[in-house]
Interface confidence: medium
Amino acid sequence: PGPPPGPPRVSPDPRAELDSTVLLTRSLLADTRQLAAQLRDKFPADGDHNLDSLPTLAMSAGALGALQLPGVLTRLRADLLSYLRHVQWLRRAGGSSLKTLEPELGTLQARLDRLLRRLQLLMSRLALPQPPPDPPAPPLAPPSSAWGGIRAAHAILGGLHLTLDWAVRGLLLLKTRL
């Protein structure tokens, strides 16, 4: 008559779910920090670097008090999707200079993708409203020069590091409120 039914599904403990997401985010933060340091060693940054296509900063000290889990996860997922797209673009169009950051850049992309899937899973496990499918983003223009690619890499890795840093703090804070 077929296999016996499996054990009843235990509803996931949201704190444990959030814990594993924090661990993944921390791990990615450390990876990004190392890669950004590697980039700085190979191509020292003169001053600050910006890229208009990168997401604006979503969190700061003042915003922490009003954090809500659905909003944080939705915004974090959207921002990390943008960074994933930028890392993919960097690997494709960044020029030969940035090939010296492989395979680390590829590893970073894979881990970023994994964290995004983890966030998606966490949102469904916590029965949070799923965000609508992302509209197709306009293609990113290739850098105008090799130096342009390096400047973009500084901006992307710096922005991702800052986003992940705040994400860890925000997720830790939200865990205490569950």
Partner: antibody, heavy 117, light 110 residues
Framework: EVQLLESGGGLVQPGGSLRLSCAAS????????MNWLRQAPGKGLEWVGV????????FYADFVKGRFTISRDNSKNTLYLQMNSLRAEDTAVYYC??????????WGQGTLVTVSS | QSVLTQPPSASGTPGQRVTISCSGS????????VNWYQQLPGTAPKLLIY???LLPSGVPDRFSGSKSGTSASLAISGLRSEDEADYYC???????????FGGGTKLTVL
């Protein structure tokens, strides 16, 4: 290279005022929350307060509330600390520091404020 | 009186492993990330450990951090003379809505 350079310290009488500045370079200043911390001679570190990257929020330690005000000018890459009604116990080296999350990843070299008659 | 409690002093000989403790409560260490700072004599503090156990770029892996419940610790292995400094633990405190520090531990390399 990230650099933070404080200035404006000096000798001031009790009840007096002083404005400290912190000039930032080597990073996108407008993306980071910024803090002031202090250290009295021979004592430990003490957090004074934080201002969010866009100036929309400020938090202060209880001992300075109502006397000290943190502000910033992102167009000038500069952080400020306006100190009023100064007391002898405010004598300290004042540091500005950058915050990317929960920690202070870069600090200035500090500026000494002496409150004495 | 500091919100976080650290021993005022610690010592060790070159090559040894030393540990500095930091204890707090659920409103600070228990619920928030712990960070450690090193202050060499006459200089500004420097970030040594963040988010409990992560090392910033440039900090040797002889330094490590850990946290359990409402206590945290900093370990330094293969002690060197240049490690002689003051070490401070720090965390955000939810009750005070402020960053709090330990009183600092003066490490002497004998």
């Amino acid at each position: 290279e990230v650099q933070l350079l404080e200035s404006g310290g000096g000798l001031v009488q009790p009840g007096g005022s002083l404005r400290l500045s912190c000039a930032a370079s080597g990073f996108t200043f407008s993306h980071y929350d910024m803090n002031w911390l202090r250290q009295a001679p021979g004592k430990g570190l003490e957090w004074v307060g934080v201002i969010s990257y866009d100036s929309s929020n400020k938090f202060y330690a209880d001992f300075v509330k109502g006397r000290f005000t943190i502000s910033r000018d992102n167009s000038k890459n500069t952080l400020y600390l306006q100190m009023n009604s100064l007391r002898a116990e405010d004598t300290a080296v004042y540091y500005c520091a950058r915050t990317p999350g929960s920690h202070f990843d870069y600090w200035g070299q500090g500026t000494l404020v002496t409150v004495s008659s | 009186q500091s919100v976080l409690t650290q021993p005022p002093s610690a010592s060790g000989t070159p090559g040894q492993r030393v540990t500095i403790s930091c204890s707090g409560s659920s409103s600070n260490i228990g619920n928030n990330a712990v960070n450690w700072y090193q202050q060499l004599p006459g200089t500004a503090p420097k970030l040594l450990i963040y988010y409990d156990d992560l090392l910033p770029s440039g900090v040797p892996d002889r330094f490590s951090g850990s946290k359990s419940g409402t206590s945290a610790s900093l370990a330094i292995s293969g002690l060197r003379s240049e490690d002689e400094a003051d070490y401070y633990c720090s965390a955000w405190d939810d009750s005070l809505n402020a960053v709090v520090f330990g009183g600092g531990t003066k490490l002497t390399v004998l």
